[in-house]
Interface confidence: low
């Protein structure tokens, strides 16, 4: 299709190489359209179209992205070449920052019901750079933690630098919608609910003599409960004796739970003690098998392949550890009678 | 005494099973039986011990799936070798260790029986 | 798998004089390590279990210390019937849970009696 009568807006997103980041373009059709699209007709000269992202009608969750190759190729569907790039409803998510996701991404509704909507669409030309070291060195992460009841702010990365004096108007967004009434650099939390988690976009406009263009960066908050004041502790196993039957195959279970902690770096695994000597054992990966706001369960299991009588002379340990400290559960196994 | 036998020479690709034959006393719970070999000028290279009591077994990590370890009876010990390459030509030689003592250190051991792998 | 190395490769000495050969586990053993004596044509002959204990018949000019990760034999008033090759040996009686590397040998250290 024809791309010459899209609406056009330039995006910029310097990303950190110090950390992970995300980006999204919105597919920003004009308002009136939501439900039916781009029937241009209905607007008059006089009327200007209010471009905004995703306003949550079923219509527009149906778009096609596609990226326009800088030589001259035919327009690409970004779902069968950018495994990277994800389509969610009407918002293109950028999963790893790079200079090569820099170029011209088209979107336009799928079901064109008109021959006025031929014309619809939204040309999105995407500038990408990484962050020089004059920039800001003390930036805001693209990362950003609310403590659950207390006060809290989530800072516009690409402006945290800057005094709310000097910022430029600020346009957010949380999960896709306008927040319309903020408009500084930094969005304050009287109190923070878990509803306050979610994936916040702050956008500003930069010129120079030639032209003007959106800087965009985007933020991933969560809510956190306070970080644990107490080490882990095993749920399982209890008991410190097993009944086990010798020439047969064993698991042994341990489960820890931990507490919250903002930098958690959980320790699970399986030891064995046979007189003087102590080695940590190679067993299969620790999962989760239950996480909530506050604490998280981890499981790891030792896999005897059959019990020996070697086996009933040693103690098997389970180690768990977080920040705050270690706990340890030993089992000694005994040969089942009768 | 200890006594090593099945030593050939094979193509690559082949399997051999050696045997280890005790004289004078028999494999119990007492021992641990052990296969050691030795490529020609080189040292000694561990491949896998066996408890003669409840047949729980041990080996290197290269030997696993390829080398198998066991007790056949109260005085035999075989040690089955498949997908022999020329680089397991050697000197095979079984050994007795200490299971009371619980460790590998073996006080007895046999001559050795050669295995040559060539095409 | 345990790793041991061995050194020196090859260690020249006279009569009546000192050898001491190092053997480095690449994690503890506690005090699991033997030393053998192999001379050309013959199994090897075990000298020293569980670090410092000296098997039956070996004279006591063999001694072994060390333990955890650091083991030294040390062979003094050499005789012309100790030339051979010294290995030693990680021994602990593992089993298939454990990957602790169960019997691995050194390289070995060949000593030449002037």
């Known amino acids: 299709f024809n791309i010459s009568g899209c609406s056009t807006k330039k995006l910029l997103w310097t990303y950190s190489t110090r950390s992970e980041e995300e980006f999204v373009l919105f597919c920003d059709l004009p308002e009136p359209q939501k439900s039916h699209f781009c029937h241009r007709n209905r607007l008059s000269p006089k009327q200007v179209p209010e471009h905004l992202p995703f306003m949550g009608s079923n219509d527009l969750s149906d778009v096609q992205w596609y990226q326009q190759p800088s030589n001259g190729d035919p327009l690409e569907d970004i779902r069968k070449s950018y495994p990277h790039i994800i389509q969610d409803k009407c918002t293109l998510h950028f999963l790893t920052p790079g200079v090569n996701n820099s170029g011209s991404y088209i979107c336009r509704p799928k079901m064109i019901k008109s021959p006025y909507d031929v014309a619809c669409c939204v040309k999105m030309i995407l500038e990408v750079k990484p962050q020089t070291n004059a920039s800001c060195e003390y930036s805001a992460s693209h990362k950003q933690d609310l403590l659950l009841g207390s006060t809290g702010s989530i800072s516009c990365p690409s402006l945290s630098c800057q005094s709310d004096a000097q910022s430029p108007a600020v346009t957010w967004y949380k999960n896709g919608k306008l927040l319309s009434v903020e408009r500084s650099n930094r969005i304050v939390v009287d109190e923070v609910y878990d509803y306050h988690q979610g994936t916040y976009v702050c956008d500003y406009t930069q010129s120079d003599t030639v032209s003007s263009w959106t800087v965009r960066a985007v933020v991933q908050v969560r809510t956190i409960v306070g970080d644990t004041k107490l080490k882990p502790d095993i749920l399982d196993p209890v008991e410190d004796t097993l009944e086990v039957e010798l020439g047969k195959p064993l698991t042994i279970s341990c489960k820890a739970r931990f507490g919250f902690e903002r930098v958690f770096n959980p320790v699970i695994k399986w030891y064995i003690k046979d007189s003087d000597l102590e080695w940590e054992v190679s067993v299969p990966e620790a999962k989760s098998i239950k996480s909530t706001l506050k604490d998280e369960i981890i499981e790891r299991n030792i896999i005897l392949e059959k019990v020996t009588q070697r086996d009933l002379r040693r103690k098997f340990v389970c180690f768990v550890q977080n920040s705050i400290g270690n706990t340890t559960q030993s089992v000694q196994l005994k040969e089942k009678r009768g | 005494s200890l006594e090593e036998s099945g030593g050939d020479l094979v193509k690559p690709g082949a399997s051999l099973t050696l045997t280890c034959t005790a004289s004078?006393?028999?494999?119990?719970?007492?021992?641990?039986v052990c296969w050691v070999r030795q490529a020609p000028g080189k040292g000694l290279e561990w491949i896998a011990c066996?408890?003669?009591?409840?047949?729980?077994t041990d080996y290197a990590r290269w030997a696993k799936g390829r080398f198998t370890i066991s007790k056949t009876s109260s005085t035999t010990v075989t040690l089955q070798m498949t997908g022999l390459t020329a680089a397991d030509t050697a000197t095979y030689f079984c050994?007795?260790?200490?299971?009371?003592?619980?460790?590998?250190?073996?006080?007895?051991w046999g001559p050795g029986t050669l295995v040559t792998v060539s095409s | 798998d345990i790793v041991m190395t061995q050194t020196p490769a090859s260690v020249e000495a006279a009569v009546g004089g000192t050898v001491t050969i190092k053997c480095q586990a690449s994690?503890?053993?506690?005090?699991?390590l033997a030393w053998y004596q192999q001379k050309p044509g013959q199994p090897p002959k075990l000298l020293i279990y569980?670090?410092?204990t000296l098997a039956s018949g070996v004279p006591s000019r063999f001694k072994g210390s060390g333990s955890g990760t650091e083991f030294t034999l040390t062979i003094s008033d050499l005789e012309c019937a100790d030339a051979a090759t010294y290995y030693c040996?990680?021994?602990?009686?593992?089993?298939?849970?454990?990957?602790?590397?169960?019997?691995?040998f050194g390289g070995g250290t060949e000593v030449v009696v002037k």
């Open positions: 050994a007795r260790g200490d299971a009371y003592r619980d460790d590998y250190a073996s006080d007895l």
């Open positions: 004078g006393f028999s494999f119990s719970s007492r021992y641990y």
């Open positions: 066996i408890d003669a009591g409840d047949g729980s």
């Open positions: 994690q503890s053993i506690s005090s699991y």
């Open positions: 569980r670090a410092s």
């Open positions: 040996q990680s021994n602990y009686g593992s089993s298939s849970i454990s990957n602790y590397g169960g019997g691995a």
